[in-house]
């Protein structure tokens, strides 16, 4: 399910002469007007609309929180893309904000994946090959190494 | 290369009824909404509707609504629109043309096709 | 419906000049503006978008400006091909509508 298909705004345009099942709707980037007969645009950089909709409203462009780098911007079929600077992260369970990768492995376990703007680095244990989930190591316990360069976006 | 290819010029009597094709090639049909924009002798352009392979979705000027239909045959990537109850005033140039699902602007247009009514 | 009033409707310059084509919308069409170069016998070939962004493979002497209600596009060194009749149309809202047209001419 998309936003728009969430969108409270919505709702079925008035019967017209109706040639096809789908007429009543307008085309990504507008949204339809309050006597459901016309298709008004967004606004280029404000707003946009996605899909073929009967939106009231086009919705609103994210702007790009302090943090994060602005992959595209927003047009009016496409969201704003935003990615989490160098050296910081986007969770799936906290996708509000981006947290800072950590610098390097516990004592007894090696890197096998480095930062990316949605992903910490990857630790395994020497041995065992068993990933590790926990926190932060402390610093005596680093194995510092450098963070790798965003790639590609989170949002 | 995009084209869009258009029937030939045809004439009728007032009351009739015409039936232009446009014929698209070169892009996938049911990713661009085509429209039908009108331009009488010495005029200037006027929009007359669309119609979206993609949902079949068809708008329609209000200015037209009331004798204009537009459909397609998908099987040949063809679009048609058909013009009922013909008068003097619609003699002009019809041309079919082409738009992203986005802006409403038209990137690409067929070579139009002259519409005379004349008794 | 939106009225695109441009203007003038006739113009002629030298080859070389700058030239300036407006369209004044009679209500705010935000920046939903496009301008179309129709030669004799030919279809409309798209310019401009959003009142500014030049469409692939025009010429950089092409150029819009404007928004809300008031639209420009200059060509900055007018050259013999460019004869033509210009149109701009708005895109804010159905029903799409466009300017009555300016005719270029070489003086």
């Known amino acids: 399910i998309t936003q728009q298909d969430l969108a409270p705004q919505q709702r079925v345009a008035p019967q017209q002469k109706r040639s096809s099942p789908s007429e009543g709707l307008c085309p990504p980037g507008h949204h339809i007007s309050e006597d459901g007969r016309d298709c008004i645009s967004c606004k280029y950089g404000q707003d946009y609309s996605t899909h073929w909709n009967d939106l009231l409203f086009c919705l609103r462009c994210t702007r790009c929180d302090s943090g994060e780098v602005e992959l595209s911007p927003c047009t009016t079929t496409r969201n704003t893309v935003c990615q989490c600077e160098e050296g910081t992260f986007r969770e799936e369970d906290s996708p509000e904000m981006c947290r800072k990768c950590r610098t390097g492995c516990p004592r007894g376990m090696v890197k096998v994946g480095d930062c990316t703007p949605w992903s910490d680095i990857e630790c395994v244990h020497k041995e065992s090959g068993t990933k590790h989930s926990g926190e932060a190591p402390a610093v005596e316990e680093t194995v510092t190494s450098s963070p790798g360069t965003p790639a590609s976006p989170c949002s | 290369q995009v084209q869009l290819v258009q029937s030939g010029a045809e004439v009728k009597k007032p009351g009739a009824s015409v039936k232009v094709s446009c014929k698209a090639s070169?892009?996938?049909?049911?990713?661009?909404?085509l429209h039908w924009v009108r331009q009488a002798p010495g005029q200037g352009l006027e929009w007359m509707g669309w119609f979206y392979p993609g949902n079949n979705n068809i708008k329609y000027n209000e200015k037209f609504k009331d004798r204009v239909t537009i459909t397609a045959d998908k099987s040949t990537s063809t679009v048609y629109m058909e013009l009922s109850s013909l008068r003097s005033e619609d003699t002009a140039v019809y041309y079919c043309?082409?738009?992203?699902?986005?802006?409403?602007?038209?990137?690409?247009w067929g070579q139009g096709t002259l519409v005379t009514v004349s008794s | 419906d939106i009225q695109m009033t441009q203007s003038p409707s006739f113009l002629s310059a030298s080859v070389g000049d700058r030239v300036t084509i407006t369209c004044r919308a009679s209500q705010d069409v935000n920046t939903a503006v496009a301008w179309y170069q129709q030669k004799p016998g030919k279809a409309p070939k798209l310019l401009i978008y959003?009142?500014?962004t030049r469409h692939t493979g025009v010429p950089d002497r092409f150029s819009g400006s404007g928004s809300g209600t008031d639209f420009t596009l200059t060509i900055s060194s007018l050259q013999p091909e460019d004869v033509a009749t210009y149109y701009c149309?708005?895109?804010?809202?159905?029903?799409?509508?466009f300017g009555g047209g300016t005719k270029l001419e070489i003086k």
């Open positions: 959003w009142a500014s």
């Open positions: 149309q708005q895109h804010y809202i159905t029903p799409w509508t």
């Open positions: 070169g892009y996938t049909f049911t990713e661009y909404i």
């Open positions: 043309a082409r738009h992203e699902q986005g802006p409403g602007y038209f990137d690409y």
